[in-house]
């Protein structure tokens, strides 16, 4: 179905499940909040290790506009990026702050997307007559996943790009219609 590889051209940071690989981000008005959000949260899936609850993931937040061609989202979206290596929660903030990094001896734990939220964004386009919208799937949370030597690089890929919507049974389209969908959001576990 379709070409061998696919893309969607917006500035999403994260490629979407292999279907829509994204180019590198062009972040507009990018504010990095750089918070370690997930400290101490137990991972979504148990690993075969006893101190699972000790492992923590860094979730970095970026605020940016979604673009598509000459269009830009009316409002910025907040993108969550799962940051690299997992380590014991108590070591993460200080270790990162000092530029050091804890590495486990033994299995490799990586911080990868866990759940997604999808958001529909309204696009503002130059001279655009019709309201246009785009769906962007964004990472909602991260998790630590144990990687063995059998896991390949594809395990480490982040995923994402798409989104949400308004209500059924519409009468003939009023011009402002799609604004009702702007804030619709959902969360999806994969």
């Amino acid at each position: 179905q379709g070409w061998q590889a696919f893309k969607n051209d917006a500035t999403e940071i994260i490629p979407e499940l292999g279907e829509y690989p994204e180019p590198p981000p062009e972040l507009e008005n990018n504010k990095t909040m750089n918070r370690a959000e997930n400290g101490g949260r137990p991972p979504h899936h148990p690993f075969e290790t006893k101190d699972v609850s000790e492992y923590s993931c860094r979730e970095l937040h970026f605020t940016r506009y979604v673009t598509d061609g000459p269009c830009r989202s009316a409002k910025p979206v907040t993108e969550l990026v799962c940051s690299g290596q997992c380590g014991p929660a108590r070591l993460l903030p200080n270790a990162i702050g000092r530029g050091k990094w804890w590495r486990p001896s033994g299995p490799d734990f990586r911080c990868i997307p866990d759940r997604y939220r999808a958001q529909r964004v309204q696009l503002l386009c130059p001279g655009g007559e019709a309201p246009r919208a785009r769906k962007v799937r964004l990472v909602a949370s991260c998790k630590c996943k144990r990687l063995t030597r059998f896991h390949n690089q594809s395990e480490l890929k982040d995923f994402g790009t798409e989104a949400a919507r308004p209500q059924k049974g519409r009468k003939p389209r009023p011009r402002a219609r799609s604004a009702k969908a702007n804030q619709a959001e959902l969360e999806n576990a994969y």
């Epitope: 130059p126 799937r137 969908a181």
Partner: antibody, heavy 118, light 107 residues
């Protein structure tokens, strides 16, 4: 791999309705917009409308307004297009397509032939 | 409705030829134009959107250009698999509309 698989060919009488289905796999249907485009025999492409399965928003071409209904079942990732009051000029191949925007058609189904004949 | 007029309606070309298809909009559509390729008995495939952005996986021999009312799809070196019908589509204003198609045949 994104795949859209449509229901089989239909033969209908004038005045009847037809409902075409489109099963989406490869991602949740609600993460994209669903579009419907038709093509009469030997003719070009004609956009019918789009729907947003997440919230049920729809946009129909004015030509089909009042005759077309686009719905989805998000539990089965299936989109439906129902066209009523069929006439002979509705004989066409009906395609479902999906995309992350309301305006371009990224992936397409294989098409469903609808023949309207008395 | 915005009319999209494609020319020529058909053309004959040989493998290796440079092929140019044009699409003229009945009013200014900025760059809100996509191009699709359709082979007989098959569904169309997206090639180009926003007038010049190639859909990933589309070979680099396909390129699009134009803005306003005049748009062009160029195949720099025609390959055997490129013999098909090509359609332009505008998405500046509802309803989205397609051109009548250009059939590229083997000379």
């Amino acid at each position: 791999q994104v795949q859209l698989v449509q229901s089989g060919a239909e033969v209908k009488k004038p005045g009847a309705s037809v409902k075409v289905s489109c099963k989406v796999s490869g991602f949740p249907i609600k993460h994209h917009f669903q579009h419907w485009v038709r093509q009469a025999p030997g003719k070009g492409l004609e956009w019918m409308g789009w729907s947003d399965p997440e919230i049920g928003d729809t946009e129909y071409a004015s030509k089909f307004q009042g005759r077309v209904t686009m719905t989805e079942d998000t539990s089965t990732d299936t989109a439906y297009m129902e066209l009523s009051s069929l006439r002979s000029e509705d004989t066409a191949v009906y395609y479902c397509a999906t995309g992350d925007t309301t305006y371009k058609f990224d992936f397409w189904g294989q098409g469903t032939t609808v023949t309207v004949s008395s | 409705d915005i009319q999209m007029t494609q020319s020529p309606s058909s053309l004959s070309a040989s493998v290796g030829d440079r092929v140019t298809i044009t699409c003229k909009a009945s009013q200014d559509v900025h760059t809100a134009v996509a191009w699709y390729q359709q082979k007989p008995g098959k569904a169309p495939k997206l090639l180009i959107y926003w007038a010049s952005t190639r859909w990933t996986g589309v070979p680099s021999r396909f390129s699009g250009s134009g803005s306003g009312t005049d748009f062009t799809l160029t195949i720099s070196s025609l390959q055997p698999e490129d013999f098909a019908t090509y359609y332009c589509q505008q998405y500046h204003d509802y309803p989205w509309t397609f051109g009548g198609g250009t059939k590229v045949e083997i000379k």
